[in-house]
């Protein structure tokens, strides 16, 4: 159920409407919940979840990551730089979320919900951003060839890729949420 459509919302029609920040917070937590559900299926299917973070780090995926220079951490916090990084990062994750679409059997709808909810989150954040020109959109041709390459991997690598995407996306969203709370 997307944020704002749960039974509690229906039962409380006179509640104050959510602020922009509250909607973003709720949206991110909704996506995080979806990621958890997908990871349960991944972990039940393979032993990737037991692999150490260091072992998994030795991959050639260029997944978006927060760094000090992005202005999202306590040191050198910069609201506008950080917001641009969050939106850019989410746009870069979209190709990886597309890759996930055919990776789940029992959680197919959940994978779709994570993808669609991320698109909604990007829209929320773009409304918040003052400097939309600074946001670089990934090249569709590059994304298409990356998708083809990922889908051509053997089963073990596909399992690892799925696990890495989900874990990295979770960490990116958590860092984003903490930073957005300060804006």
């Amino acid at each position: 159920v997307p944020p704002g459509e749960d039974s509690k919302d229906v039962a409380a029609p006179h509640r104050q409407p959510l602020t922009s920040s509250e909607r973003i917070d709720k949206q991110i937590r909704y996506i995080l919940d979806g990621i958890s559900a997908l990871r349960k299926e991944t972990c039940n299917k393979s032993n990737m979840c037991e692999s150490s973070k260091e072992a998994l780090a030795e991959n050639n995926l260029n997944l978006p990551k927060m760094a000090e220079k992005d202005g999202c951490f306590q040191s050198g916090f910069n609201e506008e730089t950080c917001l641009v990084k969050i939106i850019t990062g989410l746009l870069e994750f979209e190709v990886y979320l597309e890759y996930l679409q055919n990776r789940f059997e029992s959680s197919e709808e959940q994978a779709r919900a994570v993808q669609m909810s991320t698109k909604v989150l990007i829209q929320f954040l773009q409304k918040k951003a003052k400097n939309l020109d600074a946001i670089t959109t990934p090249d569709p041709t590059t994304n298409a060839s990356l998708l083809t390459k990922l889908q051509a991997q053997n089963q073990w690598l596909q399992d690892m890729t799925t696990h890495l995407i989900l874990r990295s996306f979770k960490e990116f969203l958590q860092s984003s949420l903490r930073a957005l709370r300060q804006m």
Partner: antibody, heavy 122, light 111 residues
């Protein structure tokens, strides 16, 4: 009421691996956004955060202990464990397990175990 | 990772107001509102007093309050009572899901 209980050997020899378990009752360790930390306190000193395992089973460690620390869980027993390798007498401390009720934006510990004394000595 | 800086000792008389400070680098306390405070009585586990800088934990009296200014967080105890004599620790979030504690402050209630 959530309760945490540490267990493990009170005496460990230098260079060996210290292993402790925290048994949680009154709530599931996989509950959304909860995280479970290990925190220690050497005799007469302050608290030191060692590491955490979150609701998805992801682990994060103190940079100063990262190379020696491993945290894992057994969801069927509602337990999480700490392993600290290559111990020295400086690892002598009271070891606490604690719960963070919201690892996404919380970062505080509302429930603690009573602590277990571990002495490193030959 | 270096601990947050707290004064080792603070003292006061019953009824007085005391403040314990907790100073960190800007990647500890600086921007984020994730400071918590704990009370530890001798031989017992720490007990949560304050979280998210100013929010009192369940069952904690209003005599205990938290605040933050720049890179320093503070715990204020008003109407000091003899049972407040204990060690007090601050803690803060560090980047990448890490946490750090202060070195601790022993509060003595005189007289």
């Amino acid at each position: 009421e959530v309760q945490l209980q540490e267990s493990g050997p009170g005496l460990v020899k230098p260079s060996q691996t210290l292993s402790l378990t925290c048994t949680v009752s009154g709530g599931s360790i996989t509950t959304r956004y909860y995280a479970w930390s290990w925190i220690r306190q050497p005799p007469g000193k302050g608290l030191e955060w060692m590491g955490v395992i979150d609701y998805d089973g992801d682990t994060y460690y103190s940079p100063s202990l990262k190379s020696r620390t491993s945290i894992s869980w057994d969801t069927s027993k509602n337990q999480f464990s700490l392993q600290l390798s290559s111990v020295t007498p400086e690892d002598t401390a009271v070891y606490y397990c604690a719960r963070d009720p919201d690892v996404v934006t919380g970062f505080h510990y509302d429930y603690w175990g009573q602590g277990t004394q571990v002495t490193v000595s030959s | 990772q270096s601990a947050l800086t707290q004064p080792p000792l603070v003292s006061g008389t019953p009824g007085q107001t005391v403040t314990i400070s907790c100073a960190g680098a800007n990647n500890d306390i600086g921007t984020y509102a994730y400071v918590s405070w704990y009370q530890q009585l001798p031989g017992t586990a720490p007990k949560l007093l304050i979280y998210k800088v100013t929010t009192r934990a369940s069952g904690i009296p209003s005599r205990f309050s938290g605040s933050k200014s720049g890179n320093t967080a503070s715990l204020t105890i008003s109407g000091l009572q003899s049972e407040d004599e204990a060690d007090y620790y601050c803690a803060s979030y560090r980047n990448f899901n890490n946490a750090v504690f202060g070195r601790g402050t022993h509060l003595t209630v005189l007289g």
